[in-house]
C-alpha cells in the first residue's frame, strides 16, 4: 500500500485552476504569477469496506497547507468545505471518514470527484470563472464536474 | 436525543440461532458505524464485528467469522445480529454501539442496554 | 490475536488522581492503536470517554484524560467525585479489529 501522500495538480476543461482565496477553493483562469494549488491525494486504506465500481476512494487535501476537502449538510444542503486536518490522520484512521472521502473515478482524461457521504454530489465549478467550488447533483449542466488531474512525481 | 434501543432477552438451546435487533434514534445511522460487543457472565468485553450502514459492509472479529451475521435496515434505522450454532459459552450480554467520528477521531459514545442471550439446554 | 489487560479492580480518594492502564500482549501500545475508553456506572448504559488515545468526547468532564504510559494507553482521573465510581473499559484497535480489555473497577472510597 502506498502510505504517503501523492501530489497532483488540477484544472478543469476550460483551463481553470484551483487558487486558495482566503480559506477557500477558487477555479480560476491560469495566469503569469499565479499561485495554483497542489492537491495533495492518498487512497482509502480502508477500501474493501466501500462501495466497489464507484471509484477509487481517495482523501483529497492542499498539499503543504494542512487543509482537506470535506463535505457536511448545512441545513439540507451538501456543501464543499476547507477543513484544517492533516491527511495522514485521516488515511490512519480505522475506519473510512466518509465525509472527507471521493470516488475518484476516471475516464480517458478526466476525472470526477464524489462525495462518499453525500452518494451523487460531485465536487463541481460554476462555468462562470472565479467562483467557489462546490458539490452539485446537476452534471454536466451550469457546472463543470470534469477535471484533469496531472499527478506530480 | 441519541438511543439505541435492543430487543428482549433470548433463551436459546445449543445449536440453534438468535437474532438480536439495535433500534437508533436521534441519528442518522448512514452517518456512523454500528458495532455488536458482548459481556459474558464476570468477564470483559468482547469486540464481536461492525457494519456501515450506510453501504452494509461489515467487518468481524476472525473468532467470530462465520457465526455472526451484522445486517441492517436502513428505513427503519435497525441493526441485527444474528448469531448462529449457538454453544453455552456464547451465554452473554450482548451490546451495539456507535462508533461515530467527531472533531478528529472515532469514539464508542452511543451504546445500547444489552440484550441478555442464554444458551442452556 | 492481541489480549488486552486491565488492572481488575483500582481505588481512590475522593478529591485524589488515579490513572488506570490498558496493555497490549502484542507489544506497545501507541497512537495507532486509536485507544478508546467507555464507561459503565451501576444502572446506567455505558458511555464513551475518551476516543483516538487522548480526545475526550464530547460533554466528558476535564478531569479525565487519556495518554499512551510507558508503552501502555492510559485514562488518568484528577480529582476523583463519587459520581465516578464504574467500570472502565479499554478498546485497542489492530488493523482490521477491536480488542476490548478486561475493564477495570474503580471504587470512589
Known amino acids: 500500500k502506498i502510505d504517503t501522500p501523492q501530489r497532483g495538480s488540477i484544472q478543469d476543461i476550460n483551463h481553470r485552476v484551483w487558487v486558495l482565496q482566503d480559506q477557500t477553493l477558487i477555479a480560476v483562469p491560469r495566469k503569469d504569477r499565479m499561485s495554483p494549488v497542489t492537491i495533495a491525494l492518498i487512497s482509502c486504506r480502508h477500501v474493501e469496506t466501500l462501495e466497489k465500481d464507484r471509484g477509487n476512494p481517495i482523501y483529497l487535501g492542499l498539499n503543504g497547507l494542512n487543509l482537506c476537502l470535506m463535505c457536511a449538510k448545512v441545513g439540507d444542503q451538501p456543501t464543499l468545505q476547507l477543513k484544517e486536518k492533516d491527511i495522514m490522520d485521516l488515511y490512519n484512521q480505522p475506519e473510512p471518514v466518509k465525509s472527507f472521502l471521493f470516488y475518484h473515478s476516471q475516464s480517458g482524461r478526466n476525472s470526477t470527484f464524489e462525495s462518499v457521504a453525500f452518494p451523487g454530489w460531485f465536487i463541481a465549478v460554476s462555468s462562470e470563472g472565479g467562483c467557489p467550488l462546490i458539490l452539485t447533483q446537476e452534471l454536466g449542466k451550469a457546472n463543470t464536474t470534469d477535471f484533469g488531474l496531472t499527478m506530480l512525481f | 436525543q441519541v438511543q439505541l434501543v435492543q430487543s428482549g432477552a433470548e433463551v436459546k438451546k445449543p445449536g440453534a440461532s438468535v437474532k438480536v435487533s439495535c433500534k437508533a434514534s436521534?441519528?442518522?445511522?448512514?452517518?456512523?458505524?454500528i458495532h455488536w460487543v458482548r459481556q459474558a457472565p464476570g468477564q470483559g468485553l468482547e469486540w464481536i464485528g461492525r457494519?456501515?450502514?450506510?453501504?452494509?459492509?461489515?467487518r468481524y472479529d476472525p473468532k467470530f467469522q462465520g457465526r455472526a451475521t451484522i445486517t441492517t435496515d436502513t428505513s427503519t434505522s435497525t441493526v441485527y445480529l444474528e448469531f448462529s450454532s449457538l454453544r453455552s459459552e456464547d451465554t452473554a450480554v450482548y451490546y451495539c454501539?456507535?462508533?461515530?467520528?467527531?472533531?478528529?477521531?472515532?469514539?464508542?459514545?452511543?451504546w445500547g442496554q444489552g440484550t441478555l442471550v442464554t444458551v442452556s439446554s | 490475536q492481541a489480549v488486552v489487560t486491565q488492572e481488575p479492580s483500582l481505588t481512590v480518594s475522593p478529591g485524589g488522581t488515579v490513572t488506570l492502564t490498558c496493555r497490549s500482549s502484542?507489544?506497545?501500545?501507541?497512537?495507532?492503536?486509536?485507544a478508546n475508553w467507555v464507561q459503565e456506572k451501576p444502572g446506567q448504559l455505558f458511555a464513551g470517554l475518551i476516543g483516538?488515545?487522548?480526545d475526550r468526547a464530547p460533554g466528558v468532564p476535564a478531569r479525565f484524560s487519556g495518554s499512551l504510559l510507558g508503552g501502555k494507553a492510559a485514562l488518568t482521573l484528577s480529582g476523583a467525585q463519587p459520581e465516578d465510581e464504574a467500570d472502565y473499559f479499554c478498546?485497542?484497535?489492530?488493523?482490521?479489529?477491536?480488542?476490548f480489555g478486561g475493564g477495570t473497577k474503580l471504587t470512589v472510597l
Open positions: 454501539a456507535r462508533l461515530h467520528y467527531f472533531g478528529n477521531n472515532f469514539f464508542f459514545d452511543y
Open positions: 436521534g441519528f442518522n445511522i448512514k452517518d456512523t458505524y
Open positions: 457494519i456501515d450502514p450506510a453501504i452494509g459492509t461489515t
Open positions: 502484542s507489544g506497545a501500545v501507541t497512537t495507532s492503536n486509536y
Open positions: 483516538g488515545t487522548n
Open positions: 478498546a485497542l484497535w489492530f488493523s482490521n479489529h477491536w480488542v
